[in-house]
């Protein structure tokens, strides 16, 4: 096991280039952001803790035809240690809370850059 | 259910213009992607490009010149241009839909038959 | 772009035995740990039809008969054991890098 965010995480977390490298791809999208993102696409929001990769990625798939998260999508897959399809939800849900996709990636962006400033990424 | 379905004038003639509808039923486009894909007869198929449920396009680089790729929400339509046909332009054009992540062509229209001749 | 060159070009295939397709990329058509390489089966005047997604995932619906392998730049699709039905030509396509791309295509006779 690994330790991510102070939760036991089971499966690979990313390492630090990874970690950067989606922090960078986050960061890029919000910055680049004209139109609403993915067309203001709603989404679950999710807990930021244990398994974080998977939730976000099981709320993101759900997300077609957004070619802004494409790359996230890929990223968030690769660090994920199972597979996940659209329609798939977990407990790391949170289920009564949806919100935009450009909400979702900002949380999701000042949570990485927490865990990248305290070294959680091994 | 997901429906796709091609129309087109089924005879070109050379150095004009081709423009073929892709009528869509059962989804959103502002949702989804939609591929051009083609089909010379008795030969394989050939990606042309595509429109994002976003609206971005991809193309073909081969034909990225003389393609055009855009659509109407909400009319459900998706429109293809592709200019200067040529002979070898003649084929099968099918538009197709993309799944969910990791966007692989799920669902197909039947396809809409164009010969380009004078 | 992204070459992919699918061989052999053309099969036949005993029923109840097994059917090897390979596609070949010219680069590398992985990604964070995936493979964005698809497998789809067209049968004479009929759309293409997917079979196997990221190089060895079933698509619903689709039978076990029918497995893909391969990463990176080599791949293969398997049909064992082939029955009658599977008479069609297969395509590779990929949509990592670039423009998508389609596999020549690989047809299937049943002896």
């Known amino acids: 096991l690994t330790c991510l965010g102070g939760f036991a995480s089971p499966g690979p977390v990313p390492p630090s280039t990874a970690l950067r490298e989606l922090i960078e791809e986050l960061v890029n999208i919000t910055q680049n952001q004209k139109a609403p993102l993915c067309n203001g696409s709603m989404v679950w929001s999710i807990n930021l803790t244990a398994g974080m990769y998977c939730a976000a990625l099981e709320s993101l798939i759900n997300v077609s035809g957004c070619s802004a998260i494409e790359k996230t999508q890929r990223m968030l897959s690769g660090f994920c240690p199972h597979k996940v399809s659209a329609g798939q939800f977990s407990s790391l849900h949170v289920r009564d809370t949806k919100i935009e996709v450009a909400q979702f990636v900002k949380d999701l962006l000042l949570h990485l850059k927490k865990l990248f400033r305290e070294g959680q990424f091994n | 259910q997901v429906q796709l379905k091609e129309s087109g004038p089924g005879l070109v003639a050379p150095s004009q213009s081709l423009s073929i509808t892709c009528t869509v039923s059962?989804?959103?486009?502002?949702?989804?992607?939609i591929n051009w894909v083609r089909q010379p007869p008795g030969k394989g198929l050939e990606w042309l490009g595509m429109i994002w449920g976003d609206g971005n396009t991809d193309f073909n680089s081969a034909l990225k010149s003389r393609l055009s790729i855009s659509k109407d929400n909400s009319k459900s339509q998706v429109f293809l241009k592709l200019n200067s046909l040529q002979t070898d332009d003649t084929a099968r054009y099918y538009c197709?839909?993309?799944?969910?992540?990791?966007?692989?062509?799920?669902?197909w229209g039947q396809g809409t038959s164009v010969t380009v001749s004078s | 772009h992204i070459v992919l060159t699918q061989s052999p070009a053309s099969l036949a295939v005993s029923l109840g035995q097994r059917a090897t397709i390979s596609c070949r990329a010219s680069e590398t058509v992985d990604s964070y740990g995936s493979s964005f390489l698809h497998w789809y089966q067209q049968k004479p005047g009929q759309p293409p039809k997917l079979l196997i997604y990221l190089a060895s995932k079933l698509e619903s619906g689709v039978p076990a008969r029918f497995s893909g392998s391969g990463s990176r730049t080599d791949f293969t699709l398997t049909i064992d054991p082939v029955e009658a039905d599977d008479a069609a030509t297969y395509y590779c396509?990929?949509?990592?890098?670039?423009?998508?791309?389609f596999g020549g295509g690989s047809k299937l006779e049943i002896k």
């Open positions: 059962g989804f959103s486009l502002t949702g989804h992607n």
């Open positions: 197709a839909r993309d799944g969910y992540y990791p966007y692989a062509i799920k669902f």
């Open positions: 396509q990929q949509n990592n890098e670039g423009p998508r791309t």
